[in-house]
Structures are given as structure tokens and as C-alpha cells.
Interface confidence: low
């Protein structure tokens, strides 16, 4: 079987005009996923990005995410890729709100 | 069954480009990206760059001024250019899939092919 | 860049032996992003292990791997001969993404 994870992009302040954006991927499986930050449709260096485990959800499904730090102001430049089971999207960083995308099955 | 088969010229002048075409069989370029490698003669590894599934491309920074990958998912191909080579270039080129989750590890391998440059 | 340092560069063992072999990173890795390949003469690498220790399918359980930070090993608990080769680490840590210049594991 295979659920295609829900993406969920959310931005958190920090100090000195930085913020922090987190892509979560969530309710998926098979457990195999690559989460990745691109700023201008390049994928960053995994040194400026952060990574969750894949941990079990409790549904039979997984969940994990991604973090990079971005200057604020900057968010339209950023996005979140994810590839899943031969699914793959391009998720952009929420203006204001949070932003829910499901991938295609 | 999986399979990656590296094809093009074996010998190319200096200051020329080398032209490679993987072509894969068993899987589709678009549910899986791809890598060139290569390796110069009784050396070891050399990451050259990728393609993502969604056409993307990440490059060695050591090449990036002169190297270009892309895919034709219709013919399931993906190929690279590599401008003005020198005898430096010379080595075995290996095309290879990105494996799922596998975090960019190269799962499948071409056999690999010999590109010599010299005049 | 991240420099993977292997050692030792040739490990001279018999059939039946323990070998352990060393991949020391220049700068801290994340062990999601290192992995090990094995290379015969005249053939291609193959994927061995993923993210430091996740053995590929089909690949004997004589192998394993550990550890973390900068020093990462390959282990084969009993040497067949179809094992004797060379191996190399990887990192996907940072661009750009190096091999170790590997370590030749031979015949005594």
C-alpha cells in the first residue's frame, strides 16, 4: 500500500530578522521519503537544514520534517520539495498562514 | 529488472565537450532522479551532480561552470555535458539512480564507460 | 569540503577473518548521509549500506556498519572470498558530496 503524505509549511520567528521554516510531512507510508529545502529552485547544502527522525504516527504511518533558517523577508524564494513513493511536489512557504497541501495519489 | 546503460564517445579532443547518455530500463526517471560519477584511471570516486525527478539539478561546484544534466523522461534518459575537458577528464564515467528514502545513496549502477580525451 | 579519510588503504586478511574497515570525516556528518559501496575490478560500485548502518537488500548479513560524527565503520564478520574488493564511504552530508579514496581489502 501506499498513503501519500500530507506537507504542512510553517514559518516560526527568531531574533534578528531571521526566521525558522519547518516542512512536516505527516500520515505517510511506506516510511521512505526525501524532504529537502531549495531557495531559487536549488536544493540547499544539508549542512544549512535540519532533520527529523521518521518516526510511526500511531496510525500504521510515519511522520517527519525539515528545517532550514531564512532571512525574513526572503520567504518567496523558498520551498520545500518532498519525494515520496514516485510522488514528488514542490511545497512554497505560507504568506501569513499556514499552508496544507496533499500530494496526489 | 533494473538497469542503467552509459553510452557515448570514447575519445573527445581537448576543449571540447563530453557527451553521455544514461538510459534506464525497469524504473521511470520520473519517480527516481539520477547521478553522474566518475573515475580517472586507478583512482577513486568523483561525484559530478544529479538530477531530480522533477528535472532539478544539483552540481559538484568543482564542475558547475561547465556541466549541464538533463533528463528526457519519453525516451527514459538523462544525459550530461561536460564543456572545454582536458586530459584531467579523462576517467570512467557511471550513471546511477537515486534510491528512494536511501538519503541521495546511489542504489543502481551503469557499468560505467571510458572517456579518454586526447588530441 | 568534507574530506573522507579511509584507513587503512590495502587490509591484507584470509578467508574467515574480521575485518574492520575506517572512514574519519573531516568535519562532522550526519549519519543519515553516509554510506558504503563495494567495487570489484572491471565492475561498477555497489550499494552495501545506507545511513551508516541500514544493510541494502540482498547484501549478506556478514556486513554491518556503525558509527557516527566523524568516524564511521565498516565491518565484515567473516571474510568470503567474494568479498575481497575495494570499499569506499560516502558523504551526502555537504556539497560536494565525496568518496573516501577507499581501502582495498586483499588475499593474505
Known amino acids: 500500500r501506499t498513503v501519500p503524505p500530507m506537507v504542512n509549511v510553517t514559518c516560526s520567528e527568531v531574533s534578528e530578522g531571521n526566521i525558522t521554516v519547518t516542512c512536516r510531512a505527516s500520515s505517510f507510508y511506506p516510511r521512505n521519503i526525501t524532504l529537502t529545502w531549495r531557495q531559487d529552485g536549488v536544493s540547499l547544502s544539508h549542512n544549512t537544514q535540519q532533520w527529523g527522525d521518521v518516526l510511526p504516527d500511531g496510525n500504521g504511518t510515519y511522520q517527519t520534517w525539515v528545517a532550514t533558517r531564512i532571512r525574513q523577508g526572503e520567504e518567496q524564494r523558498f520551498t520545500c520539495y518532498m519525494e515520496h513513493s514516485g510522488n514528488h511536489g514542490t511545497h512554497p512557504v505560507p504568506s501569513g498562514k499556514v499552508l496544507v497541501l496533499q500530494s496526489q495519489r | 529488472q533494473v538497469q542503467l546503460q552509459e553510452s557515448g564517445p570514447g575519445l573527445v579532443k581537448p576543449s571540447e565537450t563530453l557527451s553521455l547518455t544514461c538510459t534506464v530500463s525497469?524504473?521511470?526517471?520520473?519517480?527516481?532522479?539520477g547521478h553522474w560519477i566518475r573515475q580517472p584511471p586507478g583512482k577513486g570516486l568523483e561525484w559530478i551532480g544529479m538530477?531530480?525527478?522533477?528535472?532539478?539539478?544539483d552540481y559538484n561546484a568543482a564542475f558547475i561552470s561547465r556541466v549541464t544534466i538533463s533528463v528526457d523522461t519519453s525516451k527514459n534518459q538523462f544525459s550530461l555535458k561536460l564543456s572545454s575537458v582536458t586530459a584531467a577528464d579523462t576517467a570512467v564515467y557511471y550513471c546511477?539512480?537515486?534510491?528512494?528514502?536511501?538519503?541521495?545513496?546511489?542504489?543502481?549502477w551503469g557499468q560505467g564507460t571510458l572517456v579518454t580525451v586526447s588530441s | 569540503e568534507i574530506v573522507l579519510t579511509q584507513s587503512p588503504g590495502t587490509l591484507s586478511l584470509s578467508p574467515g577473518e574480521r575485518a574492520t574497515l575506517s572512514c574519519t570525516a573531516s568535519?562532522?556528518?550526519?549519519?543519515?548521509?553516509l554510506h558504503w559501496y563495494q567495487q570489484k575490478p572491471g565492475q561498477a560500485p555497489r550499494l552495501l549500506i545506507y545511513?551508516?548502518?541500514n544493510l541494502i537488500s540482498g547484501i549478506p548479513d556478514r556486513f554491518s556498519g556503525s558509527g557516527s560524527g566523524t568516524d564511521f565503520t565498516l565491518t565484515i564478520s567473516r571474510l568470503e572470498p567474494e568479498d575481497f574488493a575495494v570499499y569506499y564511504c560516502?558523504?551526502?552530508?555537504?556539497?560536494?558530496?565525496?568518496f573516501g579514496q577507499g581501502t582495498k581489502l586483499e588475499i593474505k
Open positions: 546511477a539512480r537515486k534510491g528512494h528514502g536511501y538519503y541521495y545513496a546511489m542504489d543502481y
Open positions: 560516502h558523504q551526502y552530508h555537504r556539497s560536494p558530496f565525496t
Open positions: 525497469g524504473f521511470s526517471l520520473t519517480t527516481y532522479g
Open positions: 538530477i531530480w525527478t522533477d528535472g532539478w539539478t
Open positions: 568535519s562532522s556528518v550526519s549519519s543519515s548521509y
Open positions: 545511513s551508516t548502518s
